[in-house]
Amino acid sequence: HNTTVFQGVAGQSLQVSCPYDSMKHWGRRKAWCRQLGEKGPCQRVVSTHNLWLLSFLRRWNGSTAITDDTLGGTLTITLRNLQPHDAGLYQCQSLHGSEADTLRKVLVEVLADPLDHRDAGDLWFPGESESFEDAHVEHSISRSLLEGEIPFPPTS
């Protein structure tokens, strides 16, 4: 699995999407888990509704929400009020019995809030033609990791 990078701004919401084959994964609940270390387990953060037809109902665990479009084949995770400690490697999973298939590996990167004057530096500020409202849209910048890029710092 390639790793897809999703970048969000601290304090704002980040939406992560995980596409999948809706027929292949028919009837399966989904989950969002956080990878603990490069070879460690993936710790469940939140899973979709325990009744599969109701997977479209948003389920929350703390500031993380999950909802599943089982017809279109898109799992959506929302990280609300993104914080620096939310950065890291995650997985979207499809559950069957005690097994879990990885739908997508996701690296969440948290960018400093450009409106936070405490650490302004050379950060971007909205120009005259840009409203502050525009600065608070939900950010979901994503890219795939380039070959050779390592999502975790190498262990010594």
Epitope: S22, W26, G27, L51, W52, L53, L54, F56, T70, L71
Partner: antibody, heavy 121, light 110 residues
Framework: QVQLKESGPALVKPTQTLTLTCTFS??????????VSWIRQPPGKALEWLAL???????IYSTSLKTRLTISKDTSKNQVVLTMTNMDPVDTATYYC?????????????WGQGTLVTVSS | DIVLTQPPSVSGAPGQRVTISCSGS????????VSWYQQLPGTAPKLLIY???NRPSGVPDRFSGSKSGTSASLAITGLQAEDEADYYC???????????FGGGTKLTVL
């Protein structure tokens, strides 16, 4: 054995709010995958699903009537209540409650006898 | 709005076999299980078939269900006078995220 019975007014005036109660026995709404739906049928017409409530206070509504419907439950009394606002003569129908089994599929395995509600001034 | 399409009426002589069709789309029948209900005159509907083909206990094996693509069918063999009723199909619709019924089919036993 599983039983459901609807109760409520036989006649409501236009613009009024309808409140219907479904009293059930023989099953628990605390059981995962078990819920209660409301379904209606205007005279001589087809069945129409309205709303469903189940464990964990989860509920879903018909998209076309969502703004007018509220479904709630009292687990201790084994009752499910449906309220429908701004009633109109076209809402005249027999209203049924039915036990609903839902997970990867959904169906109604036990039905109440139904209660006829007429909307007229 | 009626999402699933059924013929308004079908008929057959006693002992014959009749089928009632239920046509939908990929967002409902194409993706989900179908159930069937029988409504005798003046009574509440009764579950006949669930999960496309399964019969609840007490339903005679003269009633059978099937599904292919975006359509489902209810077949009744050895037609009897007491089968005269309205029949409804139902399923989940993944676009509307709700339960949908067919318009119903009136079965007349000649």
């Amino acid at each position: 054995q599983v039983q459901l019975k609807e109760s409520g007014p036989a006649l409501v005036k236009p613009t009024q709010t309808l409140t219907l109660t479904c009293t059930f026995s023989g099953f628990s709404l605390s059981t995962s995958g078990v819920g209660v739906s409301w379904i209606r049928q205007p005279p001589g017409k087809a069945l129409e699903w309205l709303a469903l409530i189940f464990s964990d206070h989860d509920k879903i509504y018909s998209t076309s009537l969502k703004t007018r419907l509220t479904i709630s439950k009292d687990t201790s009394k084994n009752q499910v209540v449906l309220t429908m606002t701004n009633m109109d003569p076209v809402d005249t129908a027999t209203y049924y409650c039915a036990r609903t089994l839902i997970d990867r599929s959904v169906y109604f395995d036990y039905w109440g006898q139904g209660t006829l509600v007429t909307v007229s001034s | 709005d009626i999402v699933l399409t059924q013929p308004p009426s079908v008929s057959g002589a006693p002992g014959q076999r009749v089928t009632i069709s239920c046509s939908g789309s990929s967002s409902n029948i194409g993706h989900h299980y179908v159930s069937w209900y029988q409504q005798l005159p003046g009574t509440a509907p009764k579950l006949l078939i669930y999960d496309n083909t399964n019969r609840p206990s007490g339903v005679p094996d003269r009633f059978s269900g099937s599904k292919s693509g975006t359509s489902a069918s209810l077949a009744i063999t050895g037609l009897q006078a007491e089968d005269e009723a309205d029949y409804y199909c139902a399923t989940w619709d993944g676009l509307m995220n709700s339960i949908v019924f067919g318009g119903g089919t009136k079965l007349t036993v000649l």
